[in-house]
């Protein structure tokens, strides 16, 4: 019903986009399949903090950047906020997404991360800190701050379902995606599944949920057959290149 | 460790406002999106609203939209709930959880309206 | 919204049995969004699994998720005394995220 917002599963073939994409207007209804109803305008979501600008948050940008308002260099309140490029080892931060991959957030400067971000096979018991009571190593603040011990301890990485900070936190096959007001991982696309092409970076912001993207080998394109009156309504769908 | 530590109930006239507020310690707050969710006495647990790590997106139960206002304060590590127009209804401990699926809880906060 | 429908609603059995509580959804949930909670009187809930079969940290492994589509199980293989409680589903696939009504887990 329309009381109900439904995600779309990347295990659900062929389904318009329900926001942000091809998939009808905010506002909208889009009927999907039989007894599923994509709301396009989210009835539960509230935009009273958000600017439409080009991003909200760090996760609308590309892997090698970070939201923020460009006049302070980190995220704050009010004031137009944009994808910034990400900080190599040795610039100031303020948190981990400031930094480039590979690199973390060490007492404000970007520093390199020894264990390649999330380690998730074998690392020291002391690096994980808040970790250890985190029921997913992706979720928590895991990053080296002492190196005293050297017990060993395992994470594996996240599952579909789990929370996450970045993709590289999610097993294979899953990215680490938007859904509502968390993060978690979600299934990479396969070939026809619905996707989401944005005509720029940050464009995304309204969404209330993101996809994956298409996994190897495929591109986000318009699908050949689907005619629609209106070129920025068109269904997107994985295709191979 | 990861501590979520909720204040701010107490008895309130119907009509009247409250401020909720969680303190949050032991994991980075800005990295988490942040739920309330409500459990009348006797009864299960109701969802009440969640805003996103940079508090860029708030989302509410249809129950207290338009009368509850989620927001959060990074540089505190504080999470807050406004509740203006309250009733009787919303009497509640009123628990403040992290993520999505609450991986965290406070030990929550009783919300009582009542004449 | 999505409904869950949780049962039985209240399980009698003896330390050592097995326990198998039901959540089942009114739509199908097409990915496994769906957690299970142990609650205790007097206390906050506790996660025990998430992503449909994932256990939280410092639950033991007695405690196991299974299912997708509409049925979700969580099972306790061998019942301690301190499980005895009422456990709640929650599905975070839409908005709005909804709980099960719970099911109590009582000594016999």
């Known amino acids: 019903t329309l009381n109900s917002v439904l995600i779309n599963s990347n295990a659900i073939k062929n389904l318009p986009p329900p926001l942000g994409g091809a998939g009808g207007q905010p506002g909208s209804a889009v009927s999907v399949a039989p007894g599923v109803l994509y709301e396009g305008g989210n009835k539960y979501q509230t935009l009273d903090n958000y600017q439409p600008y080009p991003c909200a948050e760090d996760e609308e940008c590309g892997s090698d950047e970070y939201c923020s308002s460009p006049s302070r260099g980190a995220a704050g309140v009010g004031g137009v906020q944009i994808c910034l490029a990400c900080r190599k080892r040795r610039k100031r931060c303020m948190r981990h997404a400031m930094c480039c991959p590979g690199n973390y957030c060490k007492n404000g400067i970007c520093m390199p991360s020894d264990h390649s971000h999330f380690p998730r096979g074998e690392i020291e018991e002391s690096i994980i800190e808040n970790l250890g009571n985190d029921h997913n190593a992706a979720a928590g603040d895991g990053y080296p701050r002492r190196t005293t011990l050297t017990s060993k301890i395992y994470h594996t990485k996240g599952q579909e379902g789990s929370v996450c900070l970045r993709s590289s936190d999610c097993a294979a096959g899953l990215c680490c995606a938007r859904h509502f007001w968390s993060k978690i991982c979600k299934p990479v696309l396969k070939e026809g599944q619905v996707c989401t092409k944005h005509k720029r970076k940050g464009s995304h912001g309204l969404e209330i949920f993101q996809r994956c993207y298409c996994g190897e080998g495929l591109a986000c394109r318009i699908q050949k057959d689907h005619h629609q009156a209106s070129n920025s309504s068109r269904l997107h769908t994985c295709q191979r290149h | 460790q990861v501590q979520l530590v909720e204040s701010g109930g107490g008895l309130v006239q119907p009509g009247g406002s409250l401020r909720l507020s969680c303190a949050a310690s032991?994991?980075?707050?800005?990295?988490?999106?942040m739920t309330w969710v409500r459990q009348a006495p006797g009864k299960g647990l109701e969802w009440v609203s969640g805003?996103?790590?940079?508090?860029?997106?708030?989302y509410y139960a249809d129950s207290v939209k338009g009368r509850f206002t989620i927001s959060r304060d990074n540089s505190k590590n504080t999470l807050y709930l406004q509740m203006n127009s309250l009733r009787a209804e919303d009497t509640a401990v009123y628990y403040c959880a992290r993520t999505i699926y609450m991986d965290y809880w406070g030990q929550g906060t009783l919300v009582t309206v009542s004449s | 919204d999505i409904v869950l429908t949780q049962s039985p609603a209240t399980l009698s059995l003896s330390p050592g049995e097995r326990a198998t509580l039901s959540c089942r959804a009114s739509?199908?949930?097409?990915?496994?969004?769906l957690a299970w909670y142990q609650q205790k009187p007097g206390q906050a809930p506790r996660l025990l699994i998430y992503g449909a079969s994932n256990r939280a940290t410092g639950v033991p492994a007695r405690f196991s998720g299974s299912g997708s589509g509409t049925d979700f199980t969580l099972t306790i293989s061998s019942l301690e005394p301190e499980d005895f409680a009422v456990y709640y589903c929650q599905q975070y696939l839409s908005l709005p995220t909804t709980f099960g009504q719970g099911t109590k887990v009582e000594i016999k």
């Open positions: 032991g994991f980075t707050f800005n990295n988490y999106g």
């Open positions: 739509q199908n949930l097409f990915s496994p969004y």
């Open positions: 805003i996103s790590g940079s508090g860029s997106y708030t």
